[in-house]
Amino acid sequence: ALLPAREATQFLRPRQRRAFQVFEEAKQGHLERECVEELCSREEAREVFENDPETDYFYPRYLDCINKYGSPYTKNSGFATCVQNLPDQCTPNPCDRKGTQACQDLMGNFFCLCKAGWGGRLCDKDVNECSQENGGCLQICHNKPGSFHCSCHSGFELSSDGRTCQDIDECADSEACGEARCKNLPGSYSCLCDEGFAYSSQEKACRDVDECLQGRCEQVCVNSPGSYTCHCDGRGGLKLSQDMDTCEDILPCVPFSVAKSVKSLYLGRMFSGTPVIRLRFKRLQPTRLVAEFDFRTFDPEGILLFAGGHQDSTWIVLALRAGRLELQLRYNGVGRVTSSGPVINHGMWQTISVEELARNLVIKVNRDAVMKIAVAGDLFQPERGLYHLNLTVGGIPFHEKDLVQPINPRLDGCMRSWNWLNGEDTTIQETVKVNTRMQCFSVTERGSFYPGSGFAFYSLDYMRTPLDVGTESTWEVEVVAHIRPAADTGVLFALWAPDLRAVPLSVALVDYHSTKKLKKQLVVLAVEHTALALMEIKVCDGQEHVVTVSLRDGEATLEVDGTRGQSEVSAAQLQERLAVLERHLRSPVLTFAGGLPDVPVTSAPVTAFYRGCMTLEVNRRLLDLDEAAYKHSDITAHSCPPVEPAAA
């Protein structure tokens, strides 16, 4: 085995000392004779030591002993001791006691033989064993006076060899992480939690991270155990972006032909049923009514025009009922209703005229007389020397209950090429030209158009009381929506509880899966803010899709084009959600089509207005938007623009 040089020297020195021993003893006897018993000169001392260094060391001190104790001849025992000690440079011992194994007297010098771990001439310097190859330690080497020892980093323990370290498995202690998962690591361990949770070392448990405090969402943030959801102002036309945190505009993904005709007059603009046009004719010269116009509608019922005086005098109303023209008239307080002619709500243009002759009224469709009614009197009524006639289009100047036969006055129809009293009508033309809301879509098809800016609502009852008196009433919500969407986000159908400001039920288009945080085009069925079922839909293909929803005690289904959607809740959760819905249905609820009122964005998965064509059937009854309790004026009740043809 090879030893470091320093250790080898230390090992050899005692052997060397033993070799000198005989010589040393002889030298001591020689010294006795020459310099203790006798007074010796320098030369004589040189002969004893046989070298200059020892002689040079000895002789000055020898003279000091003579000065101190007198010459050898005085026979002072102190002198003999003084001289005998002079050649032994280890007396008194110059070496460090702690670090010296032995002191070796040399010729005028000495050598300190150091213990292991010490060094220096006097063995007073600690040797740092750690400075070379870490003292042989695997991790930490601790130097100490004359020695060293190995230790390990936290999480490791020293092996039996005193040098190597081995990892401590903290996870072997079941209490290490408490409720959290323990993962052993080299020299350490980690307490792990599911995503959205953080480990609390004080509580030794996983605690939900409130991501909302980190300001992750651009608009509204809702924290949930282990997650969070961002919400955007749907009513403001916003939806979640791809990153599921920021908001972006809801943009049409299918272009509809929404171009309008400046030479047309839309009759369905005023949901209140009030006229879209009011004309006041006054003449000095007695005049008869002549009105002619082109007309187009899919609407089966509504008022085209009124002509005459106030409600108790003389007037006529030209209306549509069950798709056919109806004339209601009141002459001098006597009312009549006549209906005749073909069904004209086929959506094609036709020319309609009303002409007041001497003793009768003639109604024509495409120049063919469909009604000829004998009348006694004139529509222009004299008053203070002038003849007056009020003419209103798309409504009547009084309440519909005061008609001869009540009718829903709202008419989603279009008029063009109108001519009142054979006069040129620049007033209406000018007004219509600058007001696009008074204009009709250039082309329309059957359906109802939701422009993405409003809703309609109804007051419908979903509770059914069985015939057996005393039995519990049941409930049912069955919705069939025929949709041709223009945008990928929006509420199709919803129930709103005004008293609680809650959304008990909603069916909507959405372009992401909220829990999976995944962009995907879906139809969502939800009770309040909880999605019950989801179904994929190709929303931007320009085609008509059928969304069917059926909810009753114990079951909830969602279908898109005949394919059943996937449930998002457990059976127990479903029952709990349906119980919530039933509780709401026992109180007053309003049925919304195409959007929601101003509710918090967290009330339902979607709050945005629907854009596109849609007809709704609720509990096997087709909803007529003209019959709604309220309808946004931009929703067209019985017409929808077609999808724009793809550019060649």
Epitope: R280, F281, K282, R283, L284, Q285, P286, T287, R384, G385, L386, L421, N422, G423, E424
Partner: antibody
Framework: QVHLVQSGPELKKPGASVKISCKAS????????MNWVRQAPGQGLKWMGW????????TYTEEFKGRFVFSLDTSVTTSYLQISTLKAEDTATYFC?????????WGQGTLVTVSS | ETTLTQSPSSLSVSTGDRVTITCITS??????MNWYQQKPGKPPKLLIS???TLRPGVPSRFSSSGSGTDFTLTISSTQPEDFADYYC?????????FGQGTKVEIK
Amino acid sequence: QVHLVQSGPELKKPGASVKISCKASGYTFTNYGMNWVRQAPGQGLKWMGWINTNTGEPTYTEEFKGRFVFSLDTSVTTSYLQISTLKAEDTATYFCARDEGWFVYWGQGTLVTVSS
Amino acid sequence: ETTLTQSPSSLSVSTGDRVTITCITSTDIDDDMNWYQQKPGKPPKLLISEGNTLRPGVPSRFSSSGSGTDFTLTISSTQPEDFADYYCLQTDSVPLTFGQGTKVEIK
């Protein structure tokens, strides 16, 4: 479009008569009555009355009863105003205007000057 | 006969000024009031017809209000082309009657 074109200016002596015309076009003449309005120099407007273009029956305001006559020739869709025994105070611009209860369409006006 | 009292008879204004002309009737005429503008050598031009209805082509700086017996024509910011004579006309009853007129001149 509707046009009412009146005859040119007249200079007459007191006691003479004048007949001014108003030719209508661009609409069915008999559907609307014709009104006459006088405006004396630097003065305001005065409604004189009107004529029923269906029946030819005229109506005059109190101030213009007597020397003033409204007439028609439906074949040429023209209305006339004749003033007899002219006086200096008849000096004015006379306008025809189509009956709409109010007046939308006016003739350009005919200035009648009565001076000796 | 319904008489109309129009005021002021004349007023001098600068371009951009607001002008208000009033017409008071001797009887209640509902809203059967009309307003005309007349420039020298031209026939009157209908600005506003019954029911405070602004006529097609008339600038929106012209407006009217009133019902019953008190009526007002307002020019919100007078333009150079607005310097003219203005008349009110009631069409509630025969005989039809005009106001005496208001001359709007440049200051």
